[in-house]
Interface confidence: low
């Protein structure tokens, strides 16, 4: 239904707290360099204006679209061109082009310092002094570093953060209470960020149809008792919610997500028997819970998929009459039978089925042609299954850090032109798949591994798009989203690469490494490992292991030495010589 004032409508629906949080996220995601105080001032102005519209929907400017209101606010910021360069050119455009322009200037890798967590006492003091400002800072800092973070979900993480601080700041040992809990929230939020970015990439590159197909597969796996009409309705609504968030329409997105959660809770009988626990929770927790609810029990009496999609005499007729609906029912039926497959795999199978029908339905004897289609799925299914087995075996043997190193070597060989920081970040993230997925029950491993890897590789593609340097990466990133992971897995050593010169300074370390936290130490060592591979792309695993063991031993010895500086300056050059010899 149309509202006289869109901003008043959203303020009323969302309430002041969520309204302000979402506006802050929106501004922080668009203008990623502005300080919290600058954004907080804008948010207050927008909120005050919304309140005047709530009081009188006919008041001046209350009938303007949210894009117009928000865009005008952003364009009024002083020194926009000095701080943001060509983004300021967006302000010369009219809506909707102005918003599109803002979206195109979102930076997936902004040059901001890492978000450092203050020490416990300081955090608790500032939280107690002003919890609202404290949480505002959290929203601002996360949103500007992750310009596509799913806004209503970020409000959920802020709520989690708030609850943890409320609990832990009352404890004697604040540090040991806060650290593991906040680390847990951070890990989940980072995964949520790459997953959502993947959804926005799907939407931006391949349109709503591609996203809707993803949603149908995912929802059919989770709700196998829901009928196709129900799944289609949920997928359509979910597509709308994600389109809005990816497009910067955060108030609409959060409002529609709340509506979808309400609908699901009011229609449990036609959706799933597993929803009640989620539906008992307050809004943010409810929507989060529904998004990761366990799969419902599969109906016991599902007929074989072949009946309707291979053996039925009307296959080509049904396909020709309504291609999208027929393929949609195939995806639904296959997905509800296979909660053990990844969504990417299910979409590859649907694509294979579509290609088979396109080819066979044009032939003289279609049934003879498409009769073997299900058997042709076998290699497509075996490939990710083998990937999971091989990688989980390796993870179990090496542990997370060793597994990350193995992936780092593999990916540096595949794409040695990619910058070392990007390779290290990618390998560390890809390596976490072991901890995240390999410990799960067998039937949950494949969906966990492949869908997580796809999301991480999407980030690799986004970073590479900014400065394309590797033909290998460009080739894999320009294909369809669901083919990316198999494409990257199939890459081998890049034979076109001219090895890097050996530079001693790349492998020269100083005593300051000794005081770094363990994570930073690992990154330093992994940076050296990537550089070694760039110098010797065809080095064997044994050679690299020898060098890295020697390097670890060197660090251990010098960090324990009484005179660390002397140890590093005398032993360092010897290490460099030994490395060169080992790789000769």
């Amino acid at each position: 239904e149309a509202h006289k004032s869109e901003i008043a409508h959203r303020y009323n629906d969302l309430g002041e707290q969520h309204f302000k949080g979402l506006v802050l996220i929106a501004f922080s995601q668009y203008l990623q360099k502005c300080s919290y105080d600058e954004h907080a001032k804008l948010v207050q102005e927008v909120t005050d204006f919304a309140k005047t519209c709530v009081a009188d929907e006919s008041a001046a400017n209350c009938d303007k679209s949210l894009h117009t209101l928000f865009g005008d606010k952003l364009c009024a910021i002083p020194n926009l061109r000095e701080n943001y360069g060509e983004l300021a050119d967006c302000c010369t455009k009219q809506e909707p082009e102005r918003n599109e322009c803002f979206l195109q200037h979102k930076d997936d890798n902004p040059s901001l310092p890492p978000f450092e967590r203050p020490e416990a006492e300081a955090m608790c003091t500032s939280f107690k002094e002003n919890p609202t400002t404290f949480m505002g800072h959290y929203l601002h800092e996360v949103a500007r570093r992750h310009p596509y973070f799913y806004a209503p979900e970020l409000l959920y993480y802020a709520e989690q953060y708030n609850e943890i601080l409320t609990q832990c700041c009352a404890e004697a040992d604040k540090e040991s209470c806060l650290t593991p809990k906040l680390d847990g929230v951070k890990e989940k939020a980072l995964v949520s960020s790459v997953r959502q970015r993947m959804k926005c990439s799907s939407m931006q590159k391949f349109g709503e149809r591609a996203f809707k197909a993803w949603a149908v597969a995912r929802l059919s796996q989770t709700f196998p008792n829901a009928d196709f009409a129900e799944i289609t309705k949920l997928a359509t609504d979910l597509t709308k919610v994600n389109k809005e968030c990816c497009h910067g329409d955060l108030l609409e997105c959060a409002d529609d997500r709340a509506e979808l959660a309400k609908y699901m809770c009011e229609n449990q009988a036609t959706i799933s028997s597993k929803l009640q626990t989620c539906c008992d929770k307050p809004l943010l927790k409810k929507a989060h819970c529904l998004s990761e609810v366990e799969h419902d029990t599969m109906p016991a009496d599902l007929p074989a998929i072949a009946a309707d999609f291979v053996e039925d005499q009307e296959v080509c007729k049904n396909y020709a009459e309504a291609k999208d609906v027929f393929l949609g029912t195939f995806l639904y039926e296959y997905s509800r039978r296979h909660p053990d497959y990844s969504v990417s795999l299910l979409l590859r199978l649907a694509k294979k089925y579509e290609a088979t029908l396109e080819k066979c339905c044009a032939e003289a004897n279609p049934p003879a042609c498409y009769g073997t289609v299900l058997a042709e799925f076998q290699p497509l299914v075996e490939e990710p299954k083998n990937l999971v087995k091989t990688n989980c075996d390796l993870y179990e043997k090496l542990g997370e850090y060793g597994f990350q190193n193995a992936i780092l070597v593999r990916y540096t060989q595949k794409a040695p032109q990619v910058s070392t920081p990007t390779l290290v970040e990618a390998a560390r993230n890809l390596g976490r798949v072991g901890t995240k997925c390999c410990t799960l029950p067998e039937d949950q491993r494949l969906p966990c591994v492949e869908d997580y890897l796809s999301a991480i590789l999407n980030r690799v593609c986004l970073l590479h798009e900014k400065t394309p340097v590797s033909e290998h990466v460009t080739k894999c990133c320009s294909g369809s989203l669901v083919e990316r992971r198999p494409c990257f897995s199939a890459l081998t050593v890049d034979e076109t690469y001219v090895p890097k010169e050996f530079k001693a300074e790349t492998f020269t370390f100083h005593s300051d490494i000794c005081t770094l936290p363990e994570k930073e130490k690992q990154i330093k060592k992994q940076t050296a490992l990537a550089e070694l591979v760039k110098h010797k792309p065809k080095a064997t695993a044994e050679q690299l292991k020898t060098v890295m063991d020697d390097f670890a031993q060197f660090l251990d010895t010098c960090c324990k030495a009484a005179d660390k500086d002397t140890c590093f300056s005398t032993e360092g050059p010897n290490l460099v010589t030994r490395c060169k010899d080992a790789l000769a």
Partner: nanobody, 115 residues
Framework: EVQLVESGGGLVQSGGSLRLSCAAS????????MSWVRQAPGKGPEWVSA????????RYAESVKGRFTISRDNAKKTLYLQMNSLKPEDTAVYYC????????GSQGTQVTVSS
């Protein structure tokens, strides 16, 4: 198609009793928690009581605790509400709902308690 049909309402004197039934069809009844909700004239829906799928866990609104009892028979796909010591303020249309939702998907049954 999901269907919920309530019955058992009527006019009763203050202090009297009624037993409401709700016949369910079109879904796996035993897998879902169920609730009773009521709506008095001119007021919003008010949640009354809930029961889990197996029938072991029951919950009540403060206003009906000790007077009303919710139960279910999964074999018959039926939900019940035994209402004792009825008061005039219990006058409302009573609906059964799936889960613990206050949304009304059925016709309801009228309960009128006269003083």
């Amino acid at each position: 198609e999901v269907q919920l049909v309530e019955s058992g309402g009527g006019l009763v004197q203050s202090g009297g009793s009624l037993r409401l039934s709700c016949a369910a069809s079109g879904f796996t009844f035993g897998s879902f928690g169920m609730s009773w909700v009521r709506q008095a004239p001119g007021k919003g829906p008010e949640w009354v009581s809930a029961i889990d799928g197996g029938g072991a866990d029951t919950r009540y609104a403060e206003s009906v605790k000790g007077r009303f009892t919710i139960s279910r028979d999964n074999a018959k796909k039926t939900l019940y509400l035994q209402m004792n010591s009825l008061k005039p303020e219990d006058t409302a249309v009573y609906y059964c709902t799936i889960g613990q939702s206050t949304s009304r998907g059925s016709q309801g049954t009228q309960v009128t308690v006269s003083s």
